[in-house]
Amino acid sequence: EAHKSEIAHRFKDLGEQHFKGLVLIAFSQYLQKCPYEEHIKLVQEVTDFAKTCVADENAENCDKSIHTLFGDKLCAIPKLRDNYGELADCCAKQEPERNECFLQHKDDNPNLPPFQRPEAEAMCTSFQENPTSFLGHYLHEVARRHPYFYAPELLYYAEKYNEVLTQCCTESDKAACLTPKLDAVKEKALVAAVRQRMKCSSMQRFGERAFKAWAVARMSQRFPNAEFAEITKLATDVTKINKECCHGDLLECADDRAELAKYMCENQATISSKLQACCDKPVLQKSQCLAEIEHDNIPADLPSIAADFVEDKEVCKNYAEAKDVFLGTFLYEYSRRHPDYSVSLLLRLAKKYEATLEKCCAEGDPPACYGTVLAEFQPLVEEPKNLVKTNCELYEKLGEYGFQNAVLVRYTQKAPQVSTPTLVEAARNLGRVGTKCCTLPEAQRLPCVEDYLSAILNRLCVLHEKTPVSEKVTKCCSGSLVERRPCFSALTVDETYVPKEFKAETFTFHSDICTLPDKEKQIKKQTALAELVKHKPKATEDQLKTVMGDFAQFVDKCCKAADKDNCFATEGPNLVARSKEALA
């Protein structure tokens, strides 16, 4: 239904607290460099205005679209051009072009310092002094670093943060209580960020149809007892919600997400037997719980997929009459039978099926032509299964850090032109797949591994798109989203690459490395490893092992020395000389 005042409608639906949080996220994702205090002023102004519209929907400007209202606020910021350069040009445009322009200026890799978690004592002091400001800062810090973070989900993580701080700040050892709990929230949130970025990439590059296909496959796996019509309705709603969030319509997105949760809880009988526990929770937790819900049990009496999609004499007729519906039905039927496959794999199979019908239905004897299609799926299924097997075996042998290093060597050889920080970030994230997925039961490994890798590779593509340097990466990133991971897996050493000359300063270290936290130490070592590979792309595993082992011993020795600075200064050049020799 149409509302006189969109902003009043959203304020009433969402409530003041969530409304303010979402407006803060929206502003932080659009203008990523502004300090919190500047944004919170705008949030308060927008909230006060929304309240006047709730009181009187006919009040001045209350009929304006939310994009218009938000855009006008952002464009009124003093010194916008000084701080944001050409983003200020967006302000000369009218809606909807102005919002599109803002979206195009979102920066996936903003020049912001990595967010350092404050000491437990300081967090608790500031949280207890002003919980609202503290959590506002959390929303701001995450949103500006992740401009596509799924806004209603970010509100959920802020709520989790609140719970953890409320619980831990009364403990005597605050740090012991906070650290593991906040680490767990952070890990989940970072994965959520890359997954959502992939959804927005899918929407931006390939449109709603591609995203809806993803949603059909995912929903069918989760809710195998639901009818195709029900799955289609859910997929359509999820597509609309994600389109809104990816497009910056955060209030509408959050409101629609709450509506979808309400619908699912009112229609459990036709969706899944597993929803009840989620449906007893408050709105943010309910939506999150539904998004993470375990798969329902597969119906026992499902017939073979071949009956309707290979053996039926009407296959070509059914396909010709309604291609999208027929392919959607195929995707639904195949996905509900295979919770053990990744969504990417299911979409590749559906694509293969579509290509087969396109070819065969134009031939003289279609059934003879498409009769072997299911057998032709076999290599497509085997490839990711082998990927999981070999990578999980390697992870089990090397552990997370060693596995990350193996991935880093592999990817630096595939795309040595990519900047070292980007390669290190990608390899560290790709390497975490072992910890995340390889410990799961067999049936859950493949979907976990492949869908996670796809999301991480999408991040690599997004960063590479900003400054393209590798033709191979561009090629893999330009193709279909579901073919990306196989494309990257198939890349070999880039033979066109001219090795980087050896620069001693790249491998010169100082005593400051000794006081770094373990994670930062690892990043320093991995940076050196990537640089070594760029210098010697064809170095053997043994050569790299020797040099990195030597390097680790050198750091260890000098960090234990009485005069650390002197040790680094004298032993460093020896290490460089030995490394050059080992790689000669």
Epitope: Q116, A122, M123, T125, S126, E129
Partner: nanobody, 117 residues
């Protein structure tokens, strides 16, 4: 790395005013309680004032109460100390410090305030 850089010190006559600033970098400023501490020539350290992370609570040593005002601008990562009605005994090097539990884990280099006619 963490840096605290004080500025605004100088020579001022008794009864005059000065405003000290402390620019913080290398850490997330807003969640930290911040303080000013001073050291008069030949004396030990003396705590002057403390401000809570969002500025809603301030504390002062009796010797400066009513004359000094501590404030902060979290958007600029800056701590301030407005000093009015200055006296000769306020002459000291003023340090800003990042507070942690019962002590301070980082100090600035200090800025010298001299009150003399």
């Amino acid at each position: 790395e963490v840096q605290l850089l004080e500025s605004g010190g100088g020579l001022v006559q008794p009864g005059g005013s000065l405003r000290l600033s402390c620019a913080a970098s290398g850490f997330t400023f807003w969640p930290y309680t911040m303080s000013w501490v001073r050291q008069a020539p030949g004396k030990g350290l003396e705590w002057v004032s403390t401000i809570s992370p969002f500025g809603s609570t301030t504390y002062y040593a009796d010797s400066v109460k009513g004359r000094f005002t501590i404030s902060r601008d979290n958007s600029k990562n800056t701590l301030y100390l407005q000093m009015n009605s200055l006296r000769a005994e306020d002459t000291a090097v003023y340090y800003c410090a990042k507070k942690l539990s019962n002590g301070f884990d980082y100090w600035g280099q200090g800025t010298l305030v001299t009150v003399s006619s």
